[in-house]
Interface confidence: medium
């Protein structure tokens, strides 16, 4: 095996080109200069190296950059990125959105891998906040990205970035995440007129408080049932039948189909039955006429 460590005569690589695909692993190790590889990283992705050959190239780069690859190399990694471990990526300092896009492209069509998650984490931490361009890029590649962040991480999203969020980006968000995002969306869209505002804010309403829902009910917004079903139960409960009727408009008829599901079920239990009857939907389970309704939350606050 000792003689294999020397590069055979005439095989020393003078450029990164297609001829290298015919090199055995040990020849790549012996004949490709690490600095040459680093200078010509933009060529690697155009050459159909095997996974074993990519392992050798990665090893060379690891030796050249023990503290982590520079961005000039990272942006040209291409399929070599798939060979990187989260530990490798934690050594990187990625600041260019173009670099991020190039690497996300390599992983396109696959679920978010630990490598990609680490890369995104490094990138966002390096930027200090999740700006609009970054959010645009990340949600384009991973529509569920936003909902994969913790409420604490979401708190670094500036309101201006909310413009990049599409309804499908929020599909998997839980109420805690929407609690953080909703005030940012409200701020971002505050200068829009009623109908336009509602179109934009609709996806975020799972984080809306009661008073905002009451305000929306005065604006003829005609909220669909799907949106209503995603509202916070505690925000829906204080709404009156009249307010819910105004909020839903023609969609109010859909309450019947959802009467066994939260938040509709819990809301029905809080309403007077004769108020519910005014809707003419046959909703049952309200407070019978003649019963006294105590607001226990107010009683707790006073004691």
């Amino acid at each position: 095996e000792v003689e294999k460590t020397a590069c055979p005569s005439g095989k020393k690589a003078r450029e990164i080109d297609e001829s290298l695909i015919f090199y055995k692993k040990w020849e790549l190790e012996a004949c490709v200069d690490a600095a040459l590889l680093a200078t010509q990283m933009d060529r690697v992705n155009a050459i159909p190296f095997t996974y074993e050959q990519l392992d050798v190239l990665k090893h060379k780069l690891d030796e050249l950059y023990p503290q982590g690859y520079p961005e000039s190399v990272i942006q040209h990694l291409g399929y070599l990125f798939l060979k990187m471990s989260p530990e490798d990526i934690r050594k990187w300092n990625v600041t260019s959105l173009e670099t991020l896009k190039a690497l996300l492209e390599v992983n396109k069509g696959h679920e978010m891998s630990p490598q990609v998650a680490t890369l995104i984490d490094r990138f966002v931490k390096g930027r200090g906040q999740l700006d609009k361009d970054t959010l645009d890029t990340l949600t384009a590649f991973y529509p569920g990205y936003l909902c994969s962040l913790s409420p604490e991480e979401l708190s670094s999203v500036p309101p201006s970035s909310i413009w990049a969020v599409r309804p499908q980006d929020l599909d998997t968000c839980d109420p805690r995440q929407l609690d953080v995002l909703y005030p940012k969306a409200r701020l971002a869209f505050q200068n829009m007129n009623g109908s336009e505002y509602f179109v934009k804010i609709q996806s975020f309403l799972g984080g809306a408080p009661t008073e905002d829902l009451k305000a929306l009910s005065q604006q003829n917004v005609s909220m669909d049932l799907a949106t209503f079903m995603k509202l916070r139960t505690d925000a829906v409960l204080p709404l009156t039948v009249a307010e819910v009727q105004k909020l839903l408009g023609p969609h109010v008829e859909g309450l019947k189909a959802e009467e066994r599901h939260r938040p509709v079920r819990d809301w029905i239990l809080r309403q007077r039955q004769d108020d519910l009857d005014t809707l003419g939907l046959g909703l049952q389970g309200g407070i019978p006429n003649g019963y006294l309704v105590l607001d226990l939350s107010m009683q707790e606050a006073l004691s």
């Epitope: 003078r14 600095a35 990283m41 060529r43 950059y65 000039s72």
Partner: antibody, heavy 119, light 112 residues
Framework: QVQLQESGPGLVKPSQTLSLTCTVS??????????WSWIRQHPGKGLEWIGY???????YYNPSLKSRVTISVDTSKNQFSLKLSSVTAADTAVYYC???????????WGQGTLVTVSS | DIVMTQTPLSLSVAPGQPASISCQSS???????????LYWYLQKPGQPPQLLIY???NRFSGVPDRFSGSGSGTDFTLKISRVEAEDVGIYYC?????????FGQGTKLEIK
């Protein structure tokens, strides 16, 4: 603005070793993706690339000079150096240091220093 | 090694007139990644060379738009649409496709 400045003796005796240093200012020699090169120009002639070094110490030398060339780097001083052994009159030239950006293009050059090989 | 050959070796042009320099490489400078590694430098009298054009046709920052590059494979051209007095010097083409990187022998531009 990155600046490079060559320094070293202007006169070297035949068979001795030519030694030059390039000091980089206005930027780090450990900068991302930059390789540091030496190029020479014989009087009234064209340019000849000698070789490059990366801050990690990895080098590549022009095969025509490889047996006589050593390029080294001192990141603490932001300098890199050239040593050319067994010089002859044919090594008389203006020696330039330059930054090889992204591995392909020389974007910053020193002013050059004339080294004469003569007894 | 890749050999770079420039023509003409010298030319004299009146101010405001166009100028054209050719460069031929002994091997194609195009890589399968689509890039072509051909560069143009200008060395003004008493100065180090300065980068004009990278990857055949891209002007380096600060380079006037009267300079343009074209070509592919092994044949390349640098054009100056209207020569000015400050354009005098020696023009070099350079390849960085393959080590060792190499320069053409230079084309000296003078003003008539």
């Amino acid at each position: 603005q990155v600046q490079l400045q060559e320094s070293g003796p202007g006169l070297v005796k035949p068979s001795q070793t030519l030694s030059l240093t390039c000091t980089v200012s206005g930027g780090s020699i450990s900068g991302d993706g930059h390789f540091w090169s030496w190029i020479r120009q014989h009087p009234g002639k064209g340019l000849e690339w000698i070789g490059y070094i990366y801050y990690s110490g990895s080098t590549y030398y022009n095969p025509s000079l490889k047996s006589r060339v050593t390029i080294s780097v001192d990141t603490s001083k932001n300098q890199f150096s050239l040593k050319l052994s067994s010089v002859t009159a044919a090594d008389t030239a203006v020696y330039y240091c330059a930054r090889l950006r992204g591995g392909y293009k020389f974007d910053y050059w020193g002013q050059g220093t004339l080294v004469t090989v003569s007894s | 090694d890749i050999v770079m050959t420039q023509t003409p070796l010298s030319l004299s042009v009146a101010p405001g007139q166009p100028a054209s320099i050719s460069c031929q490489s002994s091997l194609s400078l195009q890589h399968s990644n689509g890039k072509t590694y051909l560069y143009w430098y200008l060395q003004k009298p008493g100065q180090p060379p300065q980068l004009l054009i990278y990857e055949v046709s891209n002007r380096f920052s600060g380079v006037p738009d009267r300079f343009s590059g074209s070509g592919s494979g092994t044949d390349f051209t640098l054009k100056i649409s209207r020569v000015e007095a400050e354009d005098v010097g020696i023009y070099y083409c350079m390849q960085s496709k393959q080590l060792p990187y190499s320069f053409g022998q230079g084309t000296k531009l003078e003003i008539k």
